[in-house]
């Protein structure tokens, strides 16, 4: 009897990665491509339909478009190998390979997709009034994670975490956590993205910098801008007396632009 075999039918792949799933079929001597039929399906979605020596892309489900292909060179070795690139969470499930070559048979293969919170972006900023540092960690993954903040002496600290859906993919979570703390230069803090259970956690290290770059600290602004603002005040008072109201509108617009550009510069020290 014609029998398909699989050397492995449980696959795990990381989100965004590539996977090749294989079904083996018996080939004696030379493969006759025109006698071979290969179907790959996932639940109700058609992925590959290989008939009469070619793939019929018209039937391919849109979610696999440009991402799934049958590796033709492997067919001659008796392997129906489905390659999926840029794997998504929605690709997880049970795949079925059905092969007809004289006889016919099928096998089921399960694919699990995991998305660790690996690429953790971080930011450190300072509140100009309280001198308190705000530490932020953000990452995307699946399933939901909580964020644990710890200090270098292993104290667990209380942060605030928000979870939203990712813009990249519906099932992916975007987890952002902030910690407000009084800290000194070179102190080290850790944010750990932790999912339930004993599986792998992902941690980022945040080091409090010696001095946040100008103009992150408003106090630095005032030290530099103080004398300038005083001088500007005098000039403006004189100008007010000497110039017409219409000309002043231009100065105000210019100042408004200036203030806004300073605000933009204030988007803090950032590391990824």
């Amino acid at each position: 009897a014609f029998t398909i075999t699989v050397s492995k039918d449980l696959y795990v792949v990381e989100y965004g990665g590539n996977v090749t799933m294989e079904c083996k079929f018996p080939v004696e001597k030379q493969l006759n491509l025109f006698a071979l039929i290969v179907y790959w399906e996932m639940e109700d979605k058609k992925i590959i339909q290989f008939v009469n020596g070619k793939e019929d892309l018209k039937v391919q489900h849109s979610s696999y478009s440009q991402r799934a292909q049958l590796l033709k060179d492997q067919l001659f070795l008796g392997k129906a190998a489905l390659q999926i690139t840029d794997v998504r969470l929605q690709d997880a499930g049970v795949y079925c390979c059905l092969i007809g070559y004289g006889g016919a048979d099928y096998k089921r293969i399960t694919l699990k997709v995991h998305a660790p919170y690996r690429n953790i972006s971080q930011r450190i900023s300072v509140d100009p009034v309280t001198s308190e540092h705000e530490l932020m960690c953000q990452a995307e993954g699946y399933p939901e994670a909580e964020v644990i903040w710890t200090s270098s002496d292993h104290r667990v600290l209380s942060g605030k975490t928000t979870i939203t859906n990712s813009n990249r993919e519906e099932k992916l979570f975007n987890v952002t956590s902030t910690l407000n703390i009084n800290a000194t230069a070179n102190e080290i803090f850790y944010c750990t993205f932790q999912r339930s259970g004993p599986e792998e956690n992902n941690t980022a290290e945040l080091v409090i910098p010696e001095r946040l770059p100008v103009p992150a600290s408003e106090r630095t602004h005032f030290m530099i801008l103080g004398p300038f603002l005083l001088l500007l005040g005098v000039v403006l008072a004189v100008t007010f007396c000497l110039k017409k109201h219409g000309r002043m509108m231009d100065v105000e617009k210019c100042c408004t632009r200036d203030r806004n550009s300073k605000k933009r510069n204030d988007i803090q020290f950032e590391e990824t």
């Epitope: 492995k8 039918d9 449980l10 499930g93 699946y142 399933p143 939901e144 599986e199």
Partner: antibody
């Protein structure tokens, strides 16, 4: 903290049925759930898996037909329905959360004993 | 089905001494093998995943190795808390199967 709390174990007559429950807390059903049984003084036997959304189930051939898995995601509960029970089905039944990064069991329930005897 | 065979079935070790146990698969399973410990009266607990990958919260005394058909779990220094039955499990193919277990006792 992840917890799987099981109930429903009972003394059942041969040919009878029982439904085991497994209530999950500390996580949502974004994970596949498996069932594993252990006959008294014996090793572990994998009974199958139900996917996170319940869209697919896997049973070993020797158990197919008599046992059914289901999920109630609203109640965060997994169920195992055991039918046409035989004396050799006497065992501690464990519900287990499959890991998200592979096919190993990350968390186990405390187990519940089903005794099949007349 | 893939058959998993564990040796020895029983192992007696003094605290502080190393211990080693084996698991053999009836066909190649790459690195798709996991180790569990079941203490008396308790549920099993995963110790090592994918032949050699460590598990968060598990002491680094538990070291897994092997690939293909032959696998080993080594405990570098046995502690009193380590007694119980150790199981291997393959996750290469359905149905997932467990070994029959190795019972670790303390001398």
């Amino acid at each position: 903290e992840v917890q799987l709390v099981q109930s429903g174990g009972d003394l059942v007559k041969p040919g009878g049925s029982v439904r085991l429950s497994c209530v999950a807390s500390g996580f949502t059903f974004s994970y596949a759930m498996s069932w594993v049984r252990q006959a008294p003084g014996k090793g572990l036997q994998w009974m199958g898996t139900i996917s996170d959304g319940g869209s697919y189930t896997h049973y070993p051939d020797n158990l197919m037909g008599r046992f059914t898995f289901s999920l109630d995601t609203a109640k965060n509960t997994a169920y195992l329905q055991l039918n046409s029970l035989r004396a050799e089905d006497t065992a501690v039944y464990y519900c287990a959360r499959e890991s998200y990064d592979g096919y190993y069991v990350a968390n186990w329930g405390q187990g519940t004993l089903v005794t099949v005897s007349s | 089905d893939i058959v998993m065979t564990q040796t020895p079935l029983s192992l007696s070790v003094s605290p502080g001494e190393p211990a080693s146990m084996s698991c053999r698969a009836s066909q190649s399973i790459s690195n798709n093998l996991h180790w569990y410990r079941q203490k008396p009266g308790q549920s099993p607990q995963v110790l090592v995943k994918y032949a050699s990958q460590s598990i968060s919260g598990v002491p680094d005394r538990f070291i897994g190795s092997g690939s293909g058909t032959d696998f080993t779990l080594r405990i570098s220094r046995v502690e009193a808390d380590d007694l119980g039955v150790y199981y291997c499990q393959q996750s290469n193919s359905w149905p997932q199967t467990f070994g029959q277990g190795t019972k670790l006792e303390l001398k």
